[in-house]
Interface confidence: medium
């Protein structure tokens, strides 16, 4: 059996080397000479020769200083053989433990640690964590037991101890109130990590703490009173620029200004924020009316995009806006006027009065009226009163100028301001119909074939409106009924069918047709009829002498 005591060897031993560790023995040495050898890491495998054994005595020796941080444990095997080389023992595992010395100082994981904390943070607020490591044994010794401390704080304001560090974890926290980004935006701490629970080897690193902005400063108007002027009726006109200062971080929601007009119930003004310099741009949201109000005194408040973090007074400014009078166009009331009038309204009579109001009540102005568009030249206007009369006969059936029984004229009212202003009104004359049009046939030129002639449909047209139109009455006159017949084509009698009574010679005929509307207004129209040398439906006819009254008369 083997006799091997526990083996440990401190690292970093001084010489002289080799140095005895332990003597190993086999009980078989009582029976005869025993020779010892070792194998394994540090013996016959790299690092080779760190450990040796005296062949005859069994003294295990170390040949050089050990480094626990490189190899903490060596595993060797001891062998015992007799003089004839036969093994007298099974190989025995030998564990050599390298014991730690405090030969490594702590190392921070980075040279500069960066963290941030909001200004105004309360004591106890965690800011950041610094971390150091130590290669020494932290299980069996305090050689790697790191304690953290703050060595210095720059600036030491408003207190030299604004932060504290947890000795064990390295967590840095706020310990004193008064963090103010606007006064001290960054702090630089020198932190130390020391082993042996703070009593041993040490190292330092830097912790840079950025104090982040909160909305603890209000935007403040400077100046607090403004004047501006704007012409009436113009929207989106810049009146003045409002200036504010805000100590919070520029171009952040805590700095960006939001302007509110406190007394603008009508929504007549708007303040937008210039994103570059935070100015407030006061503009008209809609046109102002000088005649209604000549001056506005606006109270404008300014806040930020985000709410204030602490209780702050809202800054206000007073803006005096003078509205400038502008000569405005006269306004027709209403802008479009409908007047119903009969188309046989007497020439020279007054149809209606169409007048405009002068918006510029503060100016004593005279309005002059004239007709701007009167395509049929039917109207005239009294330039002083706006009374509109006819200068010519109206005609509802003048379809060039009258659409859907409506004649549209444009009237202009001009004041004598400087410069002059002109307003326009639309006059719609709704022309009621009178029976001033007799019915007419369509078409008036008709073709028949000589053989087997096909009857022809003639439409009856009347430009008037019901009841001055259908049903129509048709009658052949001046002897035309001798050769021709007509009959109504539809119940409303809006068309007739014309056909010859007998075979007719080829040639041209004239037929007198009397048409009468529902109100007995009549008219005789001459139809031009050509009889062609053909059969059935008429084609193109040669021209021949006309035949009066439907009877052919030799040339």
């Amino acid at each position: 059996d083997w006799v091997i005591p526990p083996i440990s060897c401190p690292e970093n031993e001084k010489g002289p080397f080799p140095k005895n560790l332990v003597q190993i023995k086999s009980n078989k040495d009582k029976e005869g000479k025993v020779f010892y050898s070792i194998t394994g890491q540090g013996a016959d495998t790299p690092p080779v020769g760190v450990f040796i054994i005296e062949r005859e005595t069994g003294w295990l020796k170390v040949t050089e200083p050990l480094d626990r941080e490189r190899i903490a444990t060596y595993t060797l095997f001891s062998h015992a053989v007799s003089s004839n080389g036969n093994a007298v023992e099974d190989p025995m595992e030998i564990l050599i433990t390298v014991t730690d010395q405090n030969d490594n100082k702590p190392e921070f994981t980075q040279e500069v640690f960066k963290g941030s904390v909001m200004e105004g943070a309360l004591p106890g607020t965690s800011v950041m964590e610094v971390t150091a490591t130590d290669a020494d044994d932290d299980v069996n010794t305090y050689n790697a037991a790191i304690a953290y401390t703050i060595l210095s704080q720059d600036p030491e304001l408003p207190d030299k101890n604004m932060f504290t560090i947890n000795r064990n974890t390295g967590v840095i926290s706020v310990v004193t109130t008064g963090l103010d980004r606007e006064s001290f935006p960054t702090y630089t701490l020198v932190v130390q990590a020391a082993d042996l629970q703070g009593e041993g080897l040490s190292t330092t690193a830097t912790a840079v703490i950025t104090v982040t902005d909160t909305n603890d400063n209000p935007p403040i108007f400077n100046p607090t009173t403004y004047k501006g002027q704007v012409p009436e009726n113009e929207a989106n006109v810049v009146i003045t620029t409002l200036k504010v200062t805000d100590a919070d971080a520029p171009n952040t929601p805590a700095w960006e200004a939001v302007y509110t007009i406190l007394n603008d119930d009508g929504g007549q003004f708007v303040v937008t924020t210039n994103p570059v310099n935070n100015d407030g741009i006061l503009k008209t949201a809609k046109g102002l009316d000088f005649e209604a109000k000549q001056q506005y005194i606006l109270h404008v408040a300014v806040t930020n995009v985000v709410p204030f973090e602490v209780s702050l007074t809202t800054s206000t400014a007073t803006v005096t806006v003078d509205v400038l009078d502008v000569n405005e166009a006269p306004i027709f009331v209403p802008p479009e006027k409908r007047v119903e009038v009969s188309e046989d309204f007497g020439v020279g009579q007054e149809i209606t009065s169409y007048t405009a109001q002068e918006p510029d009540t503060f100016m004593e102005q005279k309005i002059t009226y004239r007709i701007w568009r009167d395509t049929a030249n039917w109207l005239e206007i009294n330039p002083d009163t706006g009374a509109i009369s006819t200068r010519a006969e109206l005609d509802r059936e003048d379809f060039e100028h009258v659409k859907n029984s409506t004649y549209t004229a444009l009237i202009i009212a001009t004041d004598n301001g400087s410069p002059v202003a002109t307003g326009t009104g639309t006059l719609l004359l709704i022309l009621s119909d009178v029976n001033d049009n007799a019915p007419i046939p369509e078409p008036r030129t008709i073709f028949f074939c000589e053989r087997n002639p096909k009857p022809q449909v003639i439409n009856i047209i009347d430009a008037d409106l019901p009841p001055n139109t259908s049903p129509f009455t048709a009658e052949l006159t001046h002897g035309a009924s001798a050769n021709w017949t007509i009959q109504y084509n539809d119940p409303t009698q809006e068309s007739i069918i014309l056909k010859p009574k007998m075979a007719l010679e080829v040639g041209d005929y004239k037929i007198n047709l009397k048409l009468m509307d529902n109100q007995n207004k009549d008219q005789v129209t001459t139809l031009e009829v050509s009889v062609c040398d053909c059969e059935g439906a008429a084609g193109v006819c040669r021209k021949a002498q006309p035949v009066e009254a439907g009877l052919q008369i030799p040339a």
Partner: antibody, heavy 118, light 113 residues
Framework: QVQLKESGPGLVAPSQSLSITCTVS????????ISWVRQPPGKGLEWLGI???????NYNSALKSRLSISKDNSKSQVFLKMNSLQTDDTARYYC????????????WGQGTSVTVSS | DIVMTQSPSSLAVSVGEKVTMSCKSS????????????LAWYQQKPGQSPKLLIY???TRESGVPDRFTGSGSGTDFTLTISSVKAEDLAVYYC?????????FGGGTKLEIK
């Protein structure tokens, strides 16, 4: 303060005529235009006509033939007359004042109810 | 006659909700001489006479709460109530005063859920 008050017969027989008076206070009829509007039960508003400060009138074309509006400036009264009433003329009749500045109705009377029934 | 068409004819919303209603005219109500839209909005609460809310299509009548906003131009107009209150239960009418007859829309009835 501005007030308009309508007074009417309440009940009118079919084919008969209707007369309503609007008495105003707090302003002058020489300065303000008055309009008549009616509202059948459970239905919307219908514009009837208008009388301008100088006495000129304009009417709803559908009712023009049987409608007449007049006024007496000295008595601060405006009159509505309508002929040939039918059951569909049953409505609440309002007189209303037009603003001088923007031509929309800025004050309304409380209305008078008219029922056309035999 | 100018025809005024309102939509929807009725709607029900909860207190605090935003509501919009439309009014369309058969012809433009924008007057070139003063660049104003001749359109008004009226509110008629149950059993009461109508009350003017908005004139010139977007100008709030004095004393009308700023939650009422009129917008639009030409032929398309909108009345918006930014945050409905129980007291806003009413019928809302638009009216044109551009041409005789000064016609009204059919109304939008606002009900509270």
């Amino acid at each position: 303060q501005v007030q308009l008050k309508e007074s009417g017969p309440g009940l009118v027989a079919p084919s008969q005529s209707l007369s309503i008076t609007c008495t105003v206070s707090g302003f002058s009829l020489t300065s303000y235009t008055i309009s008549w509007v009616r509202q059948p039960p459970g239905k919307g508003l219908e514009w009837l006509g208008i009388i301008w400060t100088a006495g000129a009138t304009n009417y709803n074309s559908a009712l023009k033939s049987r409608l007449s509006i007049s006024k007496d400036n000295s008595k601060s009264q405006v009159f509505l007359k309508m002929n040939s009433l039918q059951t569909d003329d049953t409505a609440r009749y309002y007189c209303a004042r037009y603003s001088k500045d923007y031509y929309a109705v800025d004050y309304w009377g409380q209305g008078t109810s008219v029922t056309v029934s035999s | 006659d100018i025809v005024m068409t309102q939509s929807p004819s009725s709607l029900a919303v909860s207190v605090g909700e935003k509501v919009t209603m439309s009014c369309k005219s058969s012809q433009s109500l924008l007057y070139s001489s003063n660049q104003k839209n001749y359109l008004a909005w009226y509110q008629q609460k149950p059993g009461q006479s109508p009350k003017l809310l908005i004139y010139w299509a977007s100008t709030r009548e004095s004393g009308v709460p700023d939650r009422f906003t009129g917008s639009g131009s030409g032929t398309d107009f909108t009345l918006t109530i930014s945050s409905v209150k129980a007291e806003d239960l009413a019928v809302y009418y638009c009216q044109q005063y551009y041409n005789y007859p000064y016609t009204f829309g059919g109304g939008t009835k606002l009900e509270i859920k």
